[in-house]
């Protein structure tokens, strides 16, 4: 278990307990319960209250981070009396030992790298471990391949993302023989952390008056359809003076991705490259390889 739990309760206790694996807060059921409520308060005094049926003696917190420390609270009314109990959930261990600068990105549609740095006060023998839980099945994924720096895990590579959902909970635990290590946790949207590949199959065909650029949308981890993409084309005349503006053209995704532009013969040598983004986020991919068209003596 990743943290000490301290209970603040009146004499007749509800015996509140929290399982960080399932994010489930439970307590002893009381006979003739008329009202029950559970919630947590974080260090910034934000309150999270899951939905709860009267006859339930547990509640599950869906999307919470715990590394800053939280206080759980349960209120139960029965036909005879009322109960209240708090459960402190601190991030025990020495301050500054948790992994920091944590980030993840998905690339090539089915690979993910997560990286972090050793906590500034962490001892030399610290070792970190990454666990990922998806929002739907609450299934836990343990890091299969660690990236190491002098024997300490400072990153993780995953080549199977089938266990992930659109939103996932990341937990970096730490161990040491010397002192307690704090944990770090984070919720990440796969949409926001994916880096797209550039568009593929870029072609240019020209006639006497126009050039037609075609391309295919990149393969992505997220299930996206054609309207979810935005593209940028960089049409660039070769051998121009340095500092000359490139022509950047924005094109919305379509079933057939194409851009037709006027370019009459004889045409100078040009190059075109394309990049892609999720239209909602505009996190641009790298540019595709430049395709040349036209002639030097144009």
């Amino acid at each position: 278990e990743k943290s000490d739990l301290r209970t603040v309760a009146p004499a007749s206790s509800l015996n509140v307990r929290f399982d960080s694996r399932t994010m489930n807060l439970s307590w002893d059921c009381q006979e003739n319960t008329t009202f029950s409520k559970c919630f947590l308060t974080d260090k910034k005094n934000r309150v999270v209250e899951p939905r709860l049926s009267n006859n339930e003696c547990s509640c599950t917190f869906r999307e919470i981070c715990l590394h800053e420390g939280v206080t759980f609270e349960v209120h139960v009314n029965t036909s005879q009396r009322g109960f209240q109990q708090k459960l402190l959930y601190p991030n025990s261990g020495r301050e500054g030992t948790a992994a920091q600068n944590f980030s993840c990105f998905i690339y090539n549609a089915d690979l993910m790298n997560c990286t972090w740095a050793r906590g500034p006060t962490a001892p030399r023998d610290v070792q970190y471990f990454l666990y990922i839980r998806n929002s739907k099945r609450r299934r836990e994924i343990r890091c299969p391949y660690y990236i190491q720096d002098s024997g300490t895990h400072v990153g993780c590579h995953l080549d199977n993302l089938s266990g992930l959902t659109s939103r996932n909970y990341f937990l970096v635990n730490g161990t040491s023989r010397e002192i307690g290590i704090q944990f770090f946790d984070s919720l990440l949207d796969t949409k926001k952390i994916e880096r797209f590949n550039p568009p593929s199959n870029v072609t240019v065909r020209c006639n006497t008056t126009h050039c037609l650029v075609r391309w295919k949308q990149p393969r992505t981890y997220q299930k996206l359809s054609y309207l979810d993409f935005q593209y940028q084309l960089d049409v660039h005349r070769k051998n121009t003076q340095p500092g000359t503006e490139n022509l950047l053209i924005n094109v919305s995704g379509d079933l057939e991705n194409r851009y037709n532009f006027p370019s009459s013969e004889p045409r100078a040598k040009h190059s075109v490259k394309i990049r892609a983004a999720d239209v909602r986020i505009l996190n641009w991919s790298s540019w595709s390889e430049a395709i040349e068209f036209g002639s030097d003596d144009g």
């Epitope: 299930k223 996206l224 359809s225 309207l227 979810d228 079933l255 057939e256 909602r280």
Partner: antibody, heavy 120, light 111 residues
């Protein structure tokens, strides 16, 4: 240019079934997310179901579950809607469409619609 | 009963600006799911006018614009023309119904 060509109008008796087809041209059906939407003067547009790439399966609206079946024959780029146990209030224009956005589903291309009349 | 609520009709003179509202809830527009808008001319299939709340497919004139805020969305038509006379529908996704959800439609009349 992508086109969705639907089968012709149908008149059915209550309790019967109807099968409406939607032929895709100009693009491969296997790369598309086909949905079915019906329209009545009283209820307006009702989404019936369609292929959800996030679930990688055809999903149905709860109110039609058990009565509706959507199938696809990718070899001939044709999608089908079968609605069984027809009632008079199933009288509607049935449209196939392509969802161009996920999630939220923006229906970008539409067939011309198939009029299904249920009458005894 | 439509999940998204629209006014049944709006009207304006040629050249004027009209707006159509679309009110949803926390399980659809406020979830937040994207809003699309469709134009339906009499006897024809709907045509996508707006997707991703405010994006226009190619070929849709920039006289059509849309926005979304909280649990509501709106469509604006500026420089109203005779051929804008049609029914307009908003659409989103509803996480409680696990279904696409439509508005009841708004008839736009050009006076």
């Amino acid at each position: 240019q992508v086109q969705l060509v639907q089968s012709g109008a149908e008149v059915k008796k209550p309790g019967a079934s109807v099968k409406v087809s939607c032929k895709i041209s100009g693009h491969s059906l296997s790369e598309l997310s086909i949905h079915w939407v019906r329209q009545t003067p009283t209820k307006g547009f009702e989404w019936m179901g369609g292929f959800d790439p996030e679930e990688n399966e055809i999903v149905y609206a709860q109110r039609f579950q058990g009565r509706v079946t959507m199938t696809e024959d990718t070899s001939i780029d044709t999608a089908y809607l079968t609605l069984s146990s027809l009632r008079s209030d199933d009288t509607a224009v049935y449209y196939c469409s392509i969802a161009g956005s996920i999630p939220g589903w923006a229906f970008d291309y539409w067939g011309k619609g198939t009029m299904v009349t249920v009458s005894s | 009963q439509a999940v998204l609520t629209q006014p049944s009709s709006v009207s304006g003179a040629p050249g004027q600006r009209v707006t159509i509202s679309c009110t949803g809830s926390g399980s659809n527009i406020g979830a937040p799911y994207d809003v699309s808008w469709y134009q339906q001319l009499p006897g024809t299939a709907p045509k996508l006018l707006i997707y991703h709340n405010n994006k226009r497919p190619s070929g849709v004139p920039d006289r059509f614009s849309a926005s979304k805020s909280g649990t509501s969305a709106s469509l604006a038509i500026t420089g109203l023309q005779a051929d804008d006379e049609a029914d307009y529908y908003c659409q989103s996704y509803d996480s409680q119904l696990i279904s696409a959800a439509f508005g009841g439609g708004t008839k736009v009349t050009v006076l």
